[in-house]
């Protein structure tokens, strides 16, 4: 007998953090021989929805044609073929931004800062939230989660940020959310550049800024300086 | 009512150490980072540190970096500044303040604590 | 550092009469973001420095709406459109854009 059915390829286009009103496309990438192809979405009756593949029948759309609340969730799915159903497809997590006001992101000491120093940014809410985050442009694993640790409610949160070097420029984001749901976030605060000046690679001030804690490429997710929580938050990964 | 109070000041020699604290009501203590900022006899303002509203970050200017401790105990509501191998130059007024929404300005500011640095 | 170069040093005004003050920084405090990291502070004789202008215009609370901050860039200015016998006291700006915050030296207003 033959082993299980390679498992699809489950993605979002353009993306899975969209704003509120938003289309977004699924898409599910099986095999040629696929007849139907199935999306669950957690905590919803499954099946999700059902498509018929594409030609040439190896992936199925899913649309949705104005992002909300209810869209917000983790999704997997399956398809079909002579032989049976596949293995579900790796999670994709679809996120709404824009369900709550944005927050204020600054930097302390200051925005500006040279390099092999230390910045810290700070994510302000108006109203307490239990888990914000911090996004950088352009890189691949972008969001930095500080979580309360036990859903107490917190108006800000600190990202300390030790050394700032110029290989980490960049342009940072933050979101706030609610602990019922991680899939909805707030609005996302005005961008913050963090310039960085005086570095060692480049001894010109440099219009770049970065913020991160270690040393890497420019597509390596931001890491904390330390596991100590902050206002009573907790860090975690995506 | 916002209200800074400083206490701690006094004479010390040289090489000596002081600890400086500010007491702070009427406000969300841990939602606001302090600072320090000092103003010797005659001459103009001179920042020193300043600690986020965690207490988990701290910075300094370069005149006491290695010398001097900011902290903060947010249970309490007070901010200290620890000093240690004082210098003449050191000797000013102490003020702390306290930082508006988002960093912006010091909006808050205490009364000041003398430190006489001499022998 | 970045320096803060205040003018002038004395500033004696008629009471009623406006007055200005100007504070140049030796680079641009001009961030990406639109802002001009740079705040006026004012000490009262005896007193204790006080907020009046932060982010190069935005009127601190409870300051009287004779005091404008403006300029952008390396150049700023402090503006009293009608200065008042209260106001006499030391007046210094201050950058925030880089670690350490500098001040400038200060101005003295005194009534003639």
């Known amino acids: 007998q033959a082993g299980p059915l390679p498992k699809p390829t489950l993605w979002a286009e353009p993306g899975s953090v969209i704003s509120w009103g938003n289309s977004v496309t699924i898409w599910c990438q099986g095999t040629l021989e696929a007849r139907e192809y199935r999306l669950d979405k957690e905590e919803s009756p499954a099946p999700w929805d059902r498509q018929n593949p594409l030609e040439p029948k190896n992936k199925a759309r899913f649309s949705i044609p104005s992002m909300t609340e209810d869209y917000a969730g983790r999704y997997r799915c399956y398809y079909r073929s002579p032989v049976g159903w596949s293995q579900p497809s790796d999670p994709l997590e679809l996120v709404m931004t824009g369900a709550y006001s944005k927050p204020t992101l600054s930097a302390l000491p200051s925005p500006l800062v040279t390099s092999g120093k230390s910045v810290t940014l700070l994510c302000q809410s108006r109203s307490p939230m239990d888990t914000f985050l911090l996004i950088k442009e352009r890189a691949a694993h972008p969001l930095l989660h500080l979580r309360s640790e036990h859903g107490a409610q917190q108006h800000q949160a600190e990202f300390p940020m030790s050394p700032v070097t110029s290989v980490h420029g960049g342009t940072y984001r933050c979101f706030s959310s609610h602990g019922f749901s991680h899939y909805l976030l707030s609005h996302p605060s005005d961008p913050l550049e963090l310039i960085v000046s005086g570095s060692l690679e480049d001894p010109r001030p440099s219009p770049t800024r970065s913020v991160s804690t270690a040393a890497g490429p420019e597509d390596q997710p931001l890491m904390p300086t330390g596991s100590v929580p902050h206002s009573g938050l907790r860090r975690h990964w995506e | 009512e916002v209200q800074l109070l400083e206490s701690g000041g006094g004479l010390v020699q040289p090489g000596g150490s002081l600890r400086l604290s500010c007491a702070a009501s009427?406000?969300?203590?841990?939602?606001?980072?302090m600072s320090w900022v000092r103003q010797a006899p005659g001459k103009g303002l001179e920042w020193v540190s300043v600690?986020?509203?965690?207490?988990?970050?701290?910075y300094y200017a370069d005149s006491v970096k290695g010398r001097f401790t900011i902290s903060r105990d947010n249970s309490k509501n007070t901010l200290d500044l620890q000093m240690n191998s004082l210098r003449a130059e050191d000797t000013a007024v102490y003020y702390c303040a306290k930082l508006g929404d988002y960093y912006y300005g010091m909006d808050v500011w205490g009364q000041g604590t003398t430190v006489t640095v001499s022998s | 550092d970045i320096v803060m170069t205040q003018s002038p040093l004395s500033l004696p005004v008629t009471p009623g009469e406006p007055a200005s003050i100007s504070c140049r920084s030796s680079?641009?405090?001009?961030?990406?973001?639109?802002?001009?990291?740079l705040d006026w502070y004012l000490q009262k004789p005896g007193q204790s420095p006080q907020l009046l202008i932060y982010l190069g215009s935005n009127r601190a609370s409870g300051v009287p709406d004779r005091f404008s901050g403006s300029g952008s860039g390396t150049d700023f200015t402090l503006k009293i459109s009608r200065v008042e016998a209260e106001d006499v006291g030391v007046y210094y700006c201050m950058q925030a854009l880089q670690a350490p915050w500098t001040f400038g030296q200060g101005t003295k207003l005194e009534i003639k």
């Open positions: 009427g406000f969300t203590f841990s939602s606001y980072a």
């Open positions: 600690i986020s509203g965690s207490g988990g970050s701290t």
């Open positions: 680079q641009s405090l001009l961030h990406s973001n639109g802002y001009n990291y």
